[in-house]
Interface confidence: low
């Protein structure tokens, strides 16, 4: 199912997926002075069996101007090696997209492709926080946000991420010091009783599927 | 282990002022929303007023808005409910509240949402 609201804001950082769980939505948004063509798909859905998982649908943007010209859609395996997606895209990630079951990697561009990117987020979707140039994490801890399941109820950890303004900036997990990015995170059904009893932020995965949108900058 | 204290109540006729604080232990106490709920004779435990970690958003109930504040200090680990123009109707057992949720304009916390709560402070309002 998906996620009701965004993951969570704070102060001076900014978050990235590094990885999309099937049933993720991304919206075919054209930048201004293009549309998407009469019969293109509204969005691409990542979606996949046991063994793969791939972006279904393509966007394509054509000028606003003219009603013939349909622009190129998604590039090759090749090209999206090459590519450079968000200003939060980090060149050691947490996770190898290409081998993490169930998920899709960040989307290629497409031709007219518009500078934000909405996507749509599935319950046990998790996003790494990092604090943007010129701050630093002032604490440090699972710098990540789940959305989760609760009592029927979709929401989001919140991150233990406070970024402070001095020079020196932090980074996703693995490239620094790491946040907190625990391997081997279970998915698993939220008990409504909650029994621990550490103050910490819990970022376990739900099981279940219910959407948020989520707007990301994109050079 | 995760506590919240609360303190502050007592008597007070209609009309007139308390303060409640709320003082964490135990744990990150900066990171989290925090709330307060009451629960009257009788009826079910309902929401009154919440904050974000980052202070950026404030929640009020309808029947408390305009004479609740919320505001916290996180230096000092503490959530305070400064509460004017007291109605009878305001008399109930008052319970702080933690939990990790993203605060937004459009929503209004429900007890199920809370992870952590205090044993509640008493608050009695006379006409």
């Known amino acids: 199912e998906l996620c009701d609201d965004d993951p969570p804001e704070i102060p001076h950082a900014t978050f990235k997926a590094m990885a999309y769980k099937e049933g993720t939505m991304l919206n075919c948004e054209c930048k201004r002075g293009f549309r998407r063509i009469k019969s293109g798909s509204l969005y691409m859905l990542c979606t996949g069996n046991s063994s793969h998982s791939s972006w279904d649908n393509q966007c394509q943007c054509t000028s606003s101007a003219t009603r013939n010209t349909t622009k190129q859609v998604t590039p090759q395996p090749e090209e999206q090696k090459e590519r450079k997606t968000t200003e939060m895209q980090s060149p050691m990630q947490p996770v190898d997209q290409a081998s993490l079951p169930g998920h899709c990697r960040e989307p290629p561009p497409w031709e007219n492709e518009a500078t934000e990117r909405i996507y749509h987020f599935v319950v046990g979707q998790m996003v790494y926080y990092q604090c943007v140039q010129g701050y630093r994490a002032l604490h440090r801890g699972p710098a990540e946000s789940v959305c989760k399941m609760t009592h029927g109820k979709t929401r989001w950890t919140q991150p233990q991420l406070i970024c402070t303004g001095e020079m020196e900036t932090s980074q996703f997990p693995g490239e620094e010091k790491p946040q907190a990015s625990p391997e081997g995170r279970p998915e698993s059904e939220t008990s409504c009783l909650v029994t621990t009893t550490d103050f910490q932020i819990q970022t376990e995965m739900a099981a279940t599927m219910e959407t948020s949108i989520f707007t990301t900058e994109y050079q | 282990q995760v506590q919240l204290v609360e303190s502050g109540g007592g008597l007070v006729q209609a009309g007139g002022s308390l303060r409640l604080s709320c003082a964490a232990s135990g744990g990150t106490f900066r990171t989290r929303n925090m709330g307060w709920f009451r629960r009257a004779p009788g009826k079910e435990r309902e929401f009154v007023a919440a904050v974000s970690w980052n202070v950026d958003n404030k929640l009020y109930a309808d029947s408390v808005k305009g004479r609740f504040t919320i505001s916290r200090d996180n230096g000092r680990n503490m959530v305070y409910l400064q509460m004017n123009s007291l109605k009878p109707e305001d008399t109930a057992v008052y319970y702080c509240?933690?939990?990790?949720?993203?605060?937004?304009?459009?929503?209004?916390?429900?007890?199920?949402?809370?992870?952590?709560w205090g044993q509640g402070t008493q608050v009695t309002v006379s006409s």
């Open positions: 509240a933690a939990d990790n949720i993203p605060l937004s304009s459009d929503m209004r916390p429900t007890a199920t949402e809370y992870d952590y």
